[in-house]
């Protein structure tokens, strides 16, 4: 029966994480999901000497162990207040509500001899409340708060009479509230009961280190729960129609290697010493886990007692949350990884135990306790546990019929006291009146309820479509090395040679014979002809590249012009364009390791010296001059934005480097306007790094204000003075004085003067962006001297979002976003999307890659045809990896060709996205001829 | 503070042309959108179109045909022309200002109104 | 066009009490995470006056006693409690899709 669940880490086959089993499921839950949020008496009722209210174990353990913490003080006051949670509830819209009973609230002191009056009218017009509102209770019985009198009487859960007492005061609440109550839980996580309350001391009754003790408290507590089962099955279930069940909580655990058995039996040892504890007896074979029973330590169930207990719960009630996990004594990890993988936990729980109806009875994870109703984590934690049940429903056929969010209200945190917050709620505990206030994480569970999950894609449907016949798809390289010598040596020696090729395979001079030698020809440069190989096989009508300053100008001003380099990149041109590929080149790209500036201009300054800018427009002109014959499509500087980060000494000397960037890219664009466009018929502009931005957390007004900001600070601060005013943009103006207003910047935005507005306004002939991925942000108060901390943003990963291994969120409606905003923002220009691309560790089938690009192109597509956007074209980024970097090539360094070269060059030859049946596009022959020797032969 | 006033004639003759200026205050139209909506007692509120603030217009596909709108950033003026208007074009026709943020597609500020009787 | 039906038409409440108008679109007025639903008020002889933008975000200057809920298809405006001041027209607004179009209105008056 039991060991199932080991084939969890058995299944060897990989799943893509592109699979749609894999990635966040945009669905609704079944039609008949319940909904609900959970409390623990203790946590929240506070009132703890009021109204005949007996002292519990956890009254004494605060006392005597949790320094510094008054309990009676500090409380979220459920008892006083039952009025606000009904308003609280209500917010959410939940169909029903998990709370406990506080048997030392009904019975002072543990026996149901006397029930305390006040007690029982508190939970009697609870009930009454939760009835009439159409919100279905669900009760647990033992939610830890053990009665002081059991324990100091009896030693509490050590003792067996505990079992018979416990089912007394069971009777008691069947009889009492049994007809409203159709669903009971008897102990909530009786695992922490023993291990912490018996094993580490870190739960009252805060024993500690008796390993036979902890043990002896599970197996009472195996039998407590069983005989209520028992009782309520026989003598209350017949006329009330309820369920009852145990709730119990986990971790769960991946192996360090799937394919090392000895990891994957550790790990089903982990989930067995912790889970399997206390659903194997109950839900298994009514006996303990087989590797726990080799001690000696563990009690035993006698054949009888097997079959007693074995079956006693109606669902698998089961809580996956922080209490689980933290501290790292709270489980065994033999040697193994915890992770918060719920979906997997769930499909563990199907193998084992036969596949049961699950109630996921607490679920959720903390903040700290400074933070007030912004817990934007816990909306990223909330989404992620509840995709994944999801994902568990839908794909794996998992039998979840509820879900509880933990907590309704911020209160008292066990061991952590009041060092953490669980709330859907803020409560300040300090206050008076005790307000409920909706934390971002409320709304969110709202809205989750509403929908009945998640229904509404993030995206639009998918179109079907092309792109116009002159669409440039391109690919982009970064700096493209130059070779300074011809690497062939063929035609260059005059000797004739003999092969030996059936002997020693040497070749032997003939002599007295000279041959003609003749020039080298572009073909003779090996690097030149493997990319041409490249770039015909992905099919791309152009080819981005950037030159190297420092290898055309070594000493920076047009002193030493080498020309064997200049010689070099004529041939990358002129090859790629015998192939019909067009270049689009950079003459400056400098990177986050290499500012690419020749030595004797960095050393005076770089970018914050003018004289640079100067040099700049030399090497442009000749740049124009030696290729512009053949090159119609420039790029000044590469994401000037992200170069002048790198000077980061202080905020103003980013702006300054800044400024100047902008000042010499429309020195050159004017040069080219007035000297080299009336000749050349090219076009100029400068590419910028637009990611685009979204608030991390939609319910606070900040969030958005910061994502508005981002893109003025990121994005406006090049393009407005460049396309459109002349000046930078108002909002990073104000911001920046007023920040400076409250002693939080330094920073001074240098001014354009009148002059230097009219050269750098309009001179970009075509918008360039760069886009990789979306970010989410979240406003953070900053004050520090570098130019990002006047933004005031700080990014969030959203974990449940397909993400590349350096963290990139894979977020293709980003594009359209960003494409449509540039259109609103400024003149209607031809864009191009100058580099897109994502890394993937994949170095044959690249299936992030591949999708990345399918879903990107789709988005761009949509910009084009219902946003109207002028897009002109998409080049993928990007050719070749470097060895050192994070994988972003199409090819490897060793020039071999991944999946998506192939994915890529389809999406060219079909001019997108067209519907299936569509007829070739743009005169494309209608099968796809694939010409082996034709490689050989260019 | 924000304000949008219009000018333009309250009688068209059928089949003529209607011309509104809009004139801006308190904020640059470099940085803000302006749209055009009319109100008659037939149809209530109706989107015409909207002009951004880097110069591109977008227009309901009902008047695309003859619809233009234009603006001076200069002289914080923007333009709308409607052409063959007919007796049911009759309406009060506002400029108004959009809400000028990435994420709220709204219209916060609106011009007073032009009322448009088209009659012979 | 995105078609947005507004109920009731029309709508007499006592002072104090709540007011609520509802709008339902033709089709979907949310994506990319947004919902593109915004309300006006219209007193006679004035132009409309933003009221909620984004479904449920209050314009700044507009008392609390007005709050915009819903998703998808079904929105509410909800005016609570209502006060004499609120006599209007109040209209909702759709953005998702051009071309933007508005409900038909609610009149408001007291009772």
């Known amino acids: 029966f039991s060991g199932d669940g080991k084939a969890i880490w058995d299944k060897k086959q990989y799943v893509s994480p592109v699979n749609p089993s894999q990635l966040f499921l945009y669905d609704t839950f079944p039609k008949n999901f319940s909904w609900g949020v959970g409390t623990g008496a203790f946590q929240v009722e506070g009132s703890w000497k009021t109204d005949g209210r007996g002292p519990s174990i956890w009254d004494r353990y605060v006392y005597s162990h949790l320094r510094g913490v008054n309990g009676t003080d500090r409380s979220t006051d459920s008892y006083i207040f039952l009025e606000k949670d009904l308003l609280a509830l209500d917010f959410l819209g939940v169909s029903f509500y998990q709370f406990s009973i506080s048997w030392p609230r009904l019975f002072p002191n543990g026996t149901v001899a006397a029930v305390n009056a006040q007690g029982l009218r508190y939970y009697r017009a609870l009930l009454d409340s939760l009835v009439l509102r159409n919100i279905e209770p669900i009760v647990t019985l033992y939610h830890w708060d053990l009665p002081l009198t059991l324990q100091e009487e009896y030693g509490g859960w050590k003792n067996a009479t505990m079992i018979d007492l416990f089912n007394d005061y069971a009777t008691y609440c069947f009889q009492t509230f049994g007809d409203r109550v159709k669903y009971w839980i008897t102990i909530h996580n009786p695992y922490l009961v023993a291990w912490h309350g018996f094993g580490t001391g870190m739960h009252a009754p805060g024993e500690k280190g008796n390993l036979t003790a902890v043990y002896t408290v599970g197996h009472n507590l195996i039998k407590a729960h069983s005989k209520v089962w028992h009782n309520y099955d026989k003598n209350f279930r017949p006329h009330q129609k309820g369920w009852l069940s145990i709730t119990l909580g986990s971790h769960w655990i991946e192996p360090n290697r799937t394919d090392n058995m000895e990891d994957v039996i550790n790990c089903q040892h982990s989930m067995s010493s912790v889970l399997g504890w206390f659903a194997n007896p109950i839900h298994g074979d009514g006996d303990y886990p087989e590797f726990m029973k080799t001690g000696a330590m563990i009690p035993e169930f006698s054949e009888a007692e097997k079959e007693e207990v074995r079956g006693t719960a109606d669902f698998f009630a089961f809580s996956f949350g922080p209490n689980n996990f933290r501290p790292s004594n709270t489980v065994v990890k033999m040697g193994q990884n915890v992770s918060l993988n719920l979906r997997q936990v769930l499909n563990w729980i199907k193998l084992e135990y036969d596949d049961p109806q699950i109630l996921i009875s607490e679920n959720g994870w903390f903040t700290d306790s400074y933070i007030k109703t912004e817990d934007t984590t816990a909306i990223y934690m909330m989404k992620n546990f509840l995709n994944q049940v999801l994902q568990a429903i839908k794909f794996d056929e998992i039998r979840v019929f509820g879900y509880t969010a933990w907590t309704l209200l911020d209160g008292f945190e066990w061991q952590d006291a009041y060092t953490t917050r669980r709330g859907l709620f803020y409560v300040d505990f300090n206050s008076e009146q005790k307000e409920r206030k909706p934390k971002s994480s409320a709304h969110y569970y709202k809205q989750i309820i509403q929908d009945n999950g998640f229904p509404l894609k993030e995206s639009t449907p998918d179109m079907k479509g092309r792109f116009p016949c002159d669409f440039s798809w391109g690919v982009t390289e970064s700096v493209l090395k130059p070779e300074f010598t011809v690497s062939s040596p063929q035609f260059t020696d005059p000797h004739l040679y003999v092969w030996n090729v059936t002997g020693n395979r040497l070749l032997y001079r003939v002599e007295g014979v000279r041959l003609k030698t003749r020039p080298s020809q572009c073909t003779d440069y090996v690097s030149i002809k493997k990319r041409v190989e490249m770039l015909a096989k992905m099919k791309v009508t152009h080819y981005q590249f950037a030159l190297d300053w420092t290898s055309i100008l070594p000493t920076g001003n047009l002193s030493k012009v080498n020309r064997q380099v200049l010689r070099y990149y004529r041939c990358v041109v002129s090859e790629g364009l015998k192939l019909g590929v067009f270049p689009m080149v950079t003459l400056y790209h400098p990177t986050h390791s290499h500012l690419g500036l020749p030595l004797p201009l960095l050393s005076s300054g770089g970018w914050l010296n003018m004289n640079t800018a100067k040099a700049f427009q030399d090497y442009a002109e000749l740049c124009f001059r030696e290729l512009g014959d053949l090159v119609k499509l420039w790029i000044t500087i590469n994401e000037p934005n992200r170069l002048s980060d790198m000077y980061n000494r202080t905020s103003n000397d980013t702006y300054r480097a800044a400024h100047n960037l902008m000042i010499a890219h429309a020195q050159v664009w004017h040069l080219y306007d007035r000297q080299y466009r009336p000749v050349q018929h090219g076009a100029v502009s400068l590419s910028l790094h637009c990611d685009w931005a979204e608030p991390a957390n939609p319910f606070v007004d900040s969030h958005w204000k910061a994502a508005e900001r981002f893109l003025q600070f990121e994005i406006a601060w090049f393009a407005d003075p460049l396309f459109k005013t002349g000046d930078y943009p108002s909002v990073m103006k104000e911001y920046i004085a007023s920040k400076n207003q409250r002693g939080l910047s330094s920073s001074v935005l240098p001014r354009f003067t009148a002059k230097e507005s009219r050269l750098v306004k309009g001179t970009v002939d075509f918008y360039a962006l760069n886009h990789f991925t979306t970010r989410f942000v979240i406003h953070k108060q900053l004050n520090t001297n570098r130019s990002v901390a006047d933004r005031d943003v700080q990014f969030l990963q959203d974990i449940t979002r397909l993400s590349s291994p350096s963290r990139l969120a894979v977020t293709p409606w980003g594009v359209r976003k960003l494409l449509a905003w540039i259109r609103r923002n400024y003149r209607d220009r031809d864009i191009y999307i100058t580099a897109n691309g994502i890394d993937d560790l994949a170095l044959e089938d690249d299936q992030i890659r591949k999708y990345y690009l399918e879903k990107y192109v789709q988005e761009a597509l949509k910009a084009y045809l219902i946003d109207k956007v002028k897009i002109k074209g998409y080049y993928a980024f990007k050719l070749t990896e470097e060895k050192s970097k994070p994988r972003f090539g199409f090819f490897t360094s060793d020039f071999r060709a991944k999946s998506s070269v192939q994915f890529y060059s389809k999406l060219i030859s079909s001019s997108g996205l067209p519907a299936e049946n569509r007829s070739p596009a743009c005169g494309q022959p209608a099968e796809d001829t694939d010409c082996t020797i034709c490689s050989f032969l260019v | 503070q924000v304000q949008l006033k219009q000018s333009g004639p309250g009688l068209v003759q059928p089949s003529q042309s209607l011309s509104v200026a809009c004139t801006v205050s308190d904020f640059s139209l470099t940085t803000y959108g302006v749209h055009w909506v009319r109100q008659s007692p037939g149809k209530g509120l109706e989107w015409l179109g909207v002009i951004w603030s880097g110069g591109s217009t977008d227009y309901n596909a009902a008047f695309i045909s003859r619809l233009t709108i234009s603006k001076d950033n200069s002289k914080s003026q923007v333009f709308f022309k409607m052409n063959s208007l007919q007796t049911t074009d009759t309406a009060i026709y506002y400029c108004?200002?959009?809400?000028?943020?990435?994420?709220?597609?709204?219209?916060?500020?609106w011009g007073q109104g032009t009322s448009v009787t088209v009659s012979s | 066009d995105i078609v947005l039906t507004q109920s009731p038409t029309s709508l007499a409440v006592s002072l104090g009490q709540r007011a609520t108008i509802s709008c339902r679109a033709s089709e979907s007025v949310e994506s990319y995470g947004n919902r593109y639903m915004t309300w006006y008020q219209q007193k006679p002889g004035q132009p409309p006056k933003l009221l909620i933008y984004r479904a449920a975000n209050l314009q700044s200057g507009i008392p609390a006693r007005f709050s915009g809920s819903g998703s998808r298809t079904d929105f509410t405006l909800t005016i609570d409690p209502v006060e004499a001041d609120d006599v209007a027209t109040y209209y909702c607004?759709?953005?998702?899709?051009?071309?933007?179009?508005f409900g038909g209105g609610t009149k408001v008056e007291i009772k």
């Open positions: 108004a200002r959009d809400y000028g943020s990435t994420y709220v597609d709204a219209i916060d500020y």
């Open positions: 607004q759709q953005s998702n899709e051009d071309p933007w179009t």
